[in-house]
Interface confidence: medium
């Protein structure tokens, strides 16, 4: 469809509330350091302008693209260069280069303090101005996560408001709010990581990589839907995510709503698990569809071998329509294997493709590809064994101990990576234990590998900004589906030159005593990484001793009447002790 005014079209489709929310998210994801009030002003101006275009689509500037309108707004900010430096250089470019330039300046690791919920203050804000409270939430999440899936953020903002509606009435606001906010925070962080991986796959590996990922995932979830139906959804979904990852949030949200509508209208041919989703309002409906439970497999599925090994026409099918044939293979394999991770399914499809590529050029192709399915077993065994070993380690060490084991493992593999990144990534990798190891056997593999893909993507995203390790670059860029096996296969870096011992790194202060448990752990784990960078060959025994001594030293000083004085006296002794243990 062509519209005289794109902004008027989106305003009418989305309605004022969602329109304003999405515009706020868009600006917050680009200008991550601007105060909330500045963004509100921009949103107000854009909304007023959109309304004039709704009233008269021929009004001045209404025919401009949304990129042009948004870009002009950003570039009109007087303090742009002062606050954002070379982001202002984008303003010298024309569209579409200007928008591409803005996208490249998004910061995945902005220097913004962690949000600490204060129930009393938050309830006061909520009761004073609900609309502002909603906007502030969108702003705070969007600026910290510049690739957050915008329509999904609108959904989380509704849930956030609901939590406050309920808990601000409660006698003990904190007891009601804190666990709910923490639960929501985990969901939001997972959602951010999932979307970041989707955007990375589109931007770094192309739309086809994203479509293959979606085809496998949707085939697992909707095994009753036929290939054609899944393909249509995959195509539409790719468009939605391409738009959101590209900053076209209004178009993205609009197209997502259309896709939800289509899925619900055709749910009879897609899945039996969508009924209750389709009765919900728009944002809840889209979220529910995205999280829908896996449908049961059809009872009459034929052996895969028939179409993909025994059929004499395999090479004809492969040669004449490669993508469709391989797509059908991936669909058929995925719907039969809800227990496999998406990455594993894509690795299997790659092996199948490589085998046909080789065999179909030979004299007797059927004899050559007859055993292709046997080649898949090692691909399945590798992650299964790895998960088994790591879950055993997790059971033995507990979450904190398991994280420390991963810190040691990854610091030895890639010691060039910055300490904060190693700590963040290893801590997140360590959470796979509590997330997945308790799951039933048939869910463990997909749970673990798909979660690890999210965490390793975070490492890749952070490393790309300041590349320091060729090994990391290689694992991140060579193959999306082989990232996890690539990192797993890395061995300790023997070429690494140990860091000088810097005493300041091991200097601690009284603030350590009042820190929440997780922040205390981060301090200790930061010291552990620094220790390993200084002594990469430290034994497990030495590291255990140092960590034990560290815990004793902190406990002693936090129990002393004058914390700071104790740290000042005992700190240097602890440093000498460390050096002695590692000598």
């Amino acid at each position: 469809d062509t519209y005289k005014s794109e902004i008027a079209h989106r305003f009418k489709d989305l309605g004022e509330q969602y329109f304003k929310g999405l515009v706020l998210i868009a600006f917050s994801q680009h200008l991550q350091q601007c105060p909330y009030e500045e963004h509100v002003k921009l949103v107000r101006e854009v909304t007023e302008f959109a309304k004039t275009c709704v009233a008269d689509e021929s009004a001045e500037n209404c025919d401009k693209s949304i990129h042009t309108l948004f870009g002009d707004k950003l570039c009109a900010i007087p303090s742009l260069r002062e606050h954002y430096g070379d982001l202002a250089d984008c303003c010298e470019k024309e569209e579409p280069e200007r928008n591409e330039c803005f996208l490249q300046h998004k910061n995945d690791n902005p220097d913004i303090p962690k949000l600490k919920p204060d129930p009393v203050a938050l309830c006061a804000d909520f009761q004073e101005d609900e609309q502002k409270f909603w906007g502030k939430y969108l702003y705070e999440i969007a600026r910290r996560h510049p690739y957050f899936y915008a329509p999904e953020l609108l959904y989380y903002a509704i849930i956030y408001k609901d939590v406050f509606s309920e808990c601000c009435q409660a006698a003990d606001k904190a007891a009601c709010l804190l666990p709910k906010i923490e639960h929501l925070r985990e969901k939001v962080l997972t959602s951010a990581a999932k979307q970041r991986l989707k955007c990375a796959s589109i931007q770094k590996f192309g739309e086809r990589a994203f479509k293959a990922w979606s085809l496998a995932r949707l085939s697992q979830r909707f095994p009753k839907a036929d290939f054609t139906e899944i393909s249509k959804i995959v195509t539409d979904l790719a468009k939605v995510h391409k738009e959101c990852c590209h900053g076209d949030l209004l178009e993205c949200a609009d197209d997502r709503a259309d896709l939800a509508k289509y899925i619900c209208e055709n749910q009879d041919t897609i899945s039996t698990k969508l009924k209750e989703c389709c009765d919900k309002p728009l944002l809840e409906k889209s979220h529910c569809i995205a999280e829908a439970k896996r449908d049961e497999l059809p009872a009459d599925l034929n052996p895969l071998e028939h179409d993909f090994v025994e059929d004499k026409e395999v090479c004809k099918n492969y040669k004449e329509a490669k993508h469709v044939f391989l797509g059908t293979f991936l669909y058929e394999y995925s719907r039969r294997h809800p227990d496999y991770s998406v990455s594993l399914l894509l690795r299997i499809a790659k092996i199948y493709e490589a085998t046909l590529e080789d065999c179909c050029a030979k004299e007797d192709p059927p004899a050559c590809y007859a055993t292709v399915f046997d080649k898949f077993q090692p691909l399945v065994d590798e992650p299964k064994n790895l998960i088994k070993q790591n879950c055993e380690l997790f059971e033995k060490l507990g979450e904190y101990g398991f994280q420390n084991a991963l810190i040691v493992r990854y610091t030895k593999k890639v010691p060039q990576v910055s300490t904060p990144t190693l700590v963040e990534v290893a801590r997140k990798l360590g959470l796979v234990g509590s997330r997945c190891c308790k799951r039933p056997e048939e869910e463990r593999l997909s749970c673990a590998e798909d979660y690890l893909s999210l965490v390793l993507n975070r490492l890749c995203v952070l490393h790309e900004k300041t590349p320091v390790s060729e090994k990391v670059t290689k694992c991140c860029t060579e193959s999306l589906v082989n990232r996890r096996p690539c990192f797993s296969a890395l061995t300790p870096d023997e070429t690494y030159k140990p860091k000088e011992f810097v005493e300041g790194t091991f200097t601690f202060h009284a603030d350590l005593c009042t820190l929440p448990e997780d922040e205390k752990q981060i301090k200790k784990q930061t010291a552990l990484v620094e220790l390993l960078k200084h002594k990469p060959h430290a034994t497990e025994e030495q590291l255990r001793t140092v960590l034990g001594n560290f815990a004793a030293f902190v406990q002693k000083c936090c129990a002393a009447p004058d914390h700071e004085a104790c740290f000042a006296v005992e700190g240097p002794k602890f440093v000498i002790e460390i050096r002695g243990i590692l000598a």
Epitope: D226, F227, T228, E229, D311, K316, N317, E320, V324, T328
Partner: nanobody, 126 residues
């Protein structure tokens, strides 16, 4: 649910021609593997010709290659089988079959097709 309805059968002399049609109710028939099978009295059902979905890749049984042509008209949601140089051994009930969601994979195995028409009789006799 996919409904298939064949037409065009009848009595024809050896060497003559017939064109069978199969109208489908499925909205994605253009992207679906569809085929013609036949069953002569007292014999097994056998594959005659097939056409892949999306990309029109065609497949034929050796016994009909060069004489029969399978095609479809996506705008009419209809599959055709043009039969020339007919022989008495082509006498059979001809069925149209569909495998939705299986573009390309036109199997020659009847059991793999979930949807069938009711059949149309072709008799080749002088």
């Amino acid at each position: 649910e996919v409904q298939l309805l064949e037409s065009g059968g009848g009595l024809v002399q050896p060497g003559g021609s017939l064109r069978l049609s199969c109208a489908a109710s499925y909205r994605y028939i253009d992207e679906t593997a569809v085929a013609w099978f036949r069953q002569a009295p007292g014999k097994e059902r056998e594959f005659v010709a097939g056409i892949g979905g999306g990309v029109d890749i065609t497949y034929y049984a050796d016994s009909v290659k060069g004489r029969f042509t399978i095609s479809r008209d996506n705008s009419k949601n209809t599959l055709y089988l043009q039969m020339n140089s007919l022989r008495p051994e082509d006498t059979a009930v001809y069925y149209c079959a569909a495998r939705p969601g299986r573009p390309l994979i036109t199997s020659k195995v009847a059991d793999l097709y979930p949807y069938w028409g009711q059949g149309t009789l072709v008799t080749v006799s002088s």
